[in-house]
């Protein structure tokens, strides 16, 4: 049996912007307007802002339609992106020893691409989304999820690895993008902000999330991760967007009672297994596909993402407690732990549902829609 | 060349302790996962424990507590410090490096190769 | 825990034989199953690994097939060099308690 989990009676921002009056262009914040302090090492060395591609190369995020009373991702508020990061205040952390692909943080030295050289590639992720501009491709089918409902034992590893909260999976949990498309589950993570800072990697139509989760997958075509890094398809990740609701989320609650055990960085602890597909949005049919990269190095391309249209809710005190309980590399909050977005360099973003069509005026607007490339398939 | 030595064993009474060493070359240490296994005179292999490329390690029920993996980047060498030994710990101990590369944060694993040539703890009064 | 049941436990076999040894897991593991073959004194030596996947340099006529709790290694006509243990090893995931184990072993001698 599933949890309600979704806010399921209004549509996404309808409270603050009202669904009549969607995102428009002229409201989102301009790089130059945002700090970026935020940004992550080795954003310095990858093109800014300035040199995206124009509105015709980027693509697009989508909603549910009214009827479904699901949530929109086209109908945001308009929300600052994060600014500088908080002040390191805690001396409770050792250093942890590690390879080079350890040696990395959010915000400072050393740049990304000295760490891992892929960081600087053309098609990295995460990416903002412009539900108008995604190619509506119906060979999109639903995604389907096998095994993702967990029996208590064995226990999962829950992580505070310095950059993000994992959960490590068992074998078993499978997951197709499509015919001859199939993955096992590895391991999921979040992303988050600070108090009052949203901190999703994707965003919408300039639009920052106050969280994402992601749940990592290897194509079955290979044995290991490093096997699969840089391959088209050799690694793909579910990604969904947290936001805030009336209610406590019970799913993400199994997670969020136990980070206090896992405050400082490199600690862990055993958590009862659990259903993972409850930690996602229910619908498993509206998404957006596209093909980038790894948000952390090694950044390797190739990587399938796919980015739920449906967002999950979760309590204003369940997201404050993702957000202020773990502590990072040097004696530093973990807070802020995203990746500033990338260019898109010409990708297109696709989408499993007529996303560049509703029923509010944008769309009455002249579009540019981009066409499928999996339409053959 | 990828190889693996390792040294250390020998006669121990029980209740003693004992560190191994496992001096990898062709390869660095660092970018590997890395695992001990032993086996028994006469028996099966049986896993020992495990270190990360970031340095979490995890253990067999069987020497939790008693045993511990560490390694040292800048000599290359892996270590097994065994304390409160027992006559059962009597084995021919080796370590192996992960097949490929890993990455902390993935936690996939399948195969261990190359192995070393093993050294022989012996636990005896 | 994982636990990797191995057989049979010894094996008579003549050269040129097609020779199968069997390795169950107690749980299902996907396709993380690997086979060493060990000669005494020697080290375990990678043969197959992600359960059907022939190691550098190892014969063809090795082979391993199976996947989830039943698992296969199979030498096709057997040779001189191939009268040795064998071992499966499983893999649950080695961040959870004993999620790497090895099977008991099969010993293939000479018939």
């Known amino acids: 049996q599933r949890l309600p989990r979704m806010q399921e009676d209004s549509p996404l921002g309808g409270g603050s912007s009202g669904e009549d009056d969607p995102l428009g262009e002229e409201d989102l914040p301009s790089e130059e307007d945002s700090p970026r302090e935020e940004d992550p090492p080795g954003e310095e060395d990858l093109p800014g802002e300035e040199d995206l591609p124009g509105e015709e190369d980027l693509p697009e995020v989508k909603p549910k339609s009214e009827e479904e009373g699901s949530l929109k991702l086209e109908d945001l508020p308009t929300v600052e992106a994060p600014g500088d990061p908080q002040e390191p205040q805690n001396n409770a952390h050792r250093d942890k020893e590690g390879d080079d692909q350890s040696h990395w943080r959010y915000g400072g030295d050393p740049p990304w691409p000295r760490v891992s050289p892929a960081c600087a590639g053309r098609f990295q992720s995460p990416v903002d989304i412009r539900p108008q501009l995604a190619a509506f491709c119906p060979a999109l089918r639903p995604l389907e999820l096998l095994g993702f409902q967990l029996p208590p034992l064995p226990e999962l590893r829950l992580r505070n690895n310095g950059h993000s909260v994992q959960l490590t999976l068992p074998p078993g949990l499978e997951m197709a993008l499509g015919p001859g498309r199939e993955y096992r589950a590895l391991q999921l993570h979040l992303h988050w902000g600070a108090a009052g800072r949203p901190g999703s990697e994707h965003t919408v139509e300039g639009h920052r999330f106050p969280a994402e989760i992601h749940v990592v997958h290897l194509s079955t075509a290979f044995a290991r991760v490093d096997e699969a890094l840089g391959r088209p398809g050799g690694l793909a990740v579910l990604a969904a967007f947290l936001e805030e609701g009336p209610e406590e989320n019970s799913a993400y609650e199994q997670l969020l009672s136990r980070l206090e055990e896992i405050a400082e960085e490199g600690s862990e602890t055993q958590v009862p297994g659990l259903d993972i597909s409850a930690l996602l949005p229910s619908d498993f049919s509206r998404y957006f596909q596209y093909e980038g990269s790894l948000t952390t190095p090694p950044c390797a391309q190739g990587v399938i993402w796919t980015v739920f249209n449906q967002t999950v809710m979760l309590s204003a005190k369940q997201l404050h407690t993702l957000s202020d309980t773990l502590w990072g590399p040097g004696d530093s909050r973990l807070q802020l732990n995203f990746r500033a977005t990338q260019p898109l360099n010409g990708r297109v973003i696709e989408a499993s549902f007529p996303a560049g069509v509703d029923s509010s005026p944008r769309a009455a607007e002249p579009v540019q829609l981009n066409s499928c490339l999996a339409a053959g398939d | 060349q990828v190889q693996l030595v390792e040294s250390g064993g020998g006669l121990v009474q029980p209740g003693g302790s004992l560190r191994l060493s496992c001096s990898a070359s062709?390869?660095?240490?660092?970018?590997?996962?890395m695992i001990w296994v032993r086996q028994a005179p006469g028996k099966g292999l049986e896993y020992i424990g495990f270190?990360?490329?970031?340095?979490?390690?995890y253990y067999a029920d069987s020497v939790k507590g008693r045993f511990t993996i560490s390694r040292d980047n800048s000599k290359n060498t892996l270590y097994l410090q065994m304390n409160s030994l027992r006559a059962e710990d009597t084995a021919v101990y080796y370590c192996a490096r992960d097949r490929v590369k890993s990455y902390d944060d993935y936690g996939d694993l399948d195969a261990f190769e190359p192995w070393g040539q093993g050294t022989l703890v012996t636990v005896s009064s | 825990d994982i636990q990797m049941t191995q057989s049979p436990s010894t094996l008579s076999a003549s050269v040129g034989d097609r020779v199968t040894i069997t390795c169950q897991a107690s749980?299902?593991?996907?396709?993380?199953l690997a086979w060493y073959q060990q000669k005494p004194g020697k080290a375990p030596k990678l043969l197959i690994y992600?359960?059907?996947t022939l190691a550098s340099g190892v014969p063809s006529r090795f082979s391993g097939s199976g996947s989830g709790t039943e698992f296969t290694l199979t030498i096709s006509s057997l040779q001189c060099d191939d009268f040795a243990t064998y071992y499966c090893?499983?893999?649950?995931?080695?961040?959870?308690?004993?999620?790497?184990?090895f099977g008991g072993g099969t010993k293939v001698e000479i018939k």
């Open positions: 749980q299902s593991i996907s396709s993380y």
């Open positions: 270190i990360t490329t970031g340095g979490t390690t």
């Open positions: 992600y359960a059907s």
């Open positions: 090893l499983g893999v649950y995931g080695y961040s959870f308690d004993d999620g790497i184990a």
């Open positions: 062709g390869f660095s240490l660092n970018s590997y996962a």
